[in-house]
């Protein structure tokens, strides 16, 4: 799978994580920080 950093317009898309652009899938993906989940890493779990 080809990946690259998200475009600058996606700054802030991932609330608690790193934004990755999955080129072949034509979509952005949030790699969440430990303790966070959700499509945009918006949910905290203990």
């Amino acid at each position: 799978v080809s990946i690259t950093k998200c475009n600058s317009d996606m700054n802030g898309y991932c609330l608690h994580g790193q934004c990755i652009y999955l080129v072949d899938m034509s979509q952005n993906y949030c790699r969440c920080e430990v303790g966070y989940t959700g499509v945009r890493c918006e949910h905290f779990y203990l």
């Epitope: 317009d9 609330l15 499509v39």
Partner: antibody, heavy 116, light 106 residues
Framework: QDQLVQSGAEVKKPGASVKVSCKAS????????IQWVRQAPGQGLEWMGR????????KYREKFEGRVTITADTSTNTAYMELSSLRSEDTAVYYC?????????WGQGTLVTVSS | DIQMTQSPSSLSASVGDRVTITCKAS??????IAWYQQKPGQAPRLLIQ???TLQPGVPSRFSGSGSGTDYTFTISSLQPEDIATYYC????????FGGGTKVEIK
């Protein structure tokens, strides 16, 4: 199946406002960003602005600042684009476009006609 | 705002010809360019994103290349069904469309 269903065609008088809706099904708009694009008859595509429904923040093309308002109601999974002070050159098909989780998935378009 | 200058605005070519359209950005867009095909009365159809990544179901005669500020879209062998208007879109910083290229059969 993911869908963006837009409201029906509108006819407005110059100076009036129009509000176009864009209802999402099959996905949560909070996971995406919703862009708005328009196309006047026989003309090219023009990006107007976008909203991040989760955060509520918006970005607009400079030429539309002060005249366009993009909102989202996450409880109904619907985005809206309101354009005020309409003039004849605002006659166009208006599209909502999903971006973020999937690259550029388009609604069917809404024709807005401005005529006296 | 980033400006996108697309050329030519129209072209006429024969079936089987190689067709090339260019888009020049006013600043580096880091390969974040997409190409759309639009036929009359239809919504635009995404062909290519991230400079050269073909969307599923799009024929391999369509291709894209470029980097920095200069990008190219190519139809290697024009077919009658390719008659349409083509647009580039930069999506690095907000969004800007090129002015479009109307492709006709000679």
């Amino acid at each position: 199946q993911d869908q963006l269903v837009q409201s029906g065609a509108e006819v407005k008088k110059p100076g009036a406002s129009v509000k176009v809706s864009c209802k999402a099904s099959g996905f949560n708009i909070k996971d995406t960003r919703i862009q708005w694009v328009r196309q006047a008859p026989g003309q090219g595509l023009e990006w107007m602005g976008r909203i991040d429904p989760l955060r509520g923040n918006t970005k607009y093309r400079e030429k539309f600042e002060g005249r366009v308002t993009i909102t989202a109601d996450t409880s109904t999974n619907t985005a809206y684009m309101e354009l005020s002070s309409l003039r004849s050159e605002d006659t166009a098909v208006y599209y909502c476009v999903r971006s973020g989780t999937l690259f550029d998935f388009w609604g069917q378009g809404t024709l807005v006609t401005v005529s006296s | 705002d980033i400006q996108m200058t697309q050329s030519p605005s129209s072209l006429s070519a024969s079936v089987g010809d190689r067709v090339t359209i260019t888009c020049k950005a006013s600043q580096d867009i880091h390969k974040y360019i997409a190409w759309y095909q639009q036929k009359p009365g239809q919504a635009p159809r995404l062909l290519i994103q991230y400079t050269s990544t073909l969307q599923p179901g799009v024929p391999s005669r369509f291709s894209g290349s470029g980097s920095g500020t200069d990008y190219t879209f190519t139809i290697s062998s024009l077919q009658p069904e390719d008659i349409a208007t083509y647009y580039c879109l930069q999506y690095d910083n907000l969004r800007t469309f090129g002015g479009g290229t109307k492709v006709e059969i000679k």
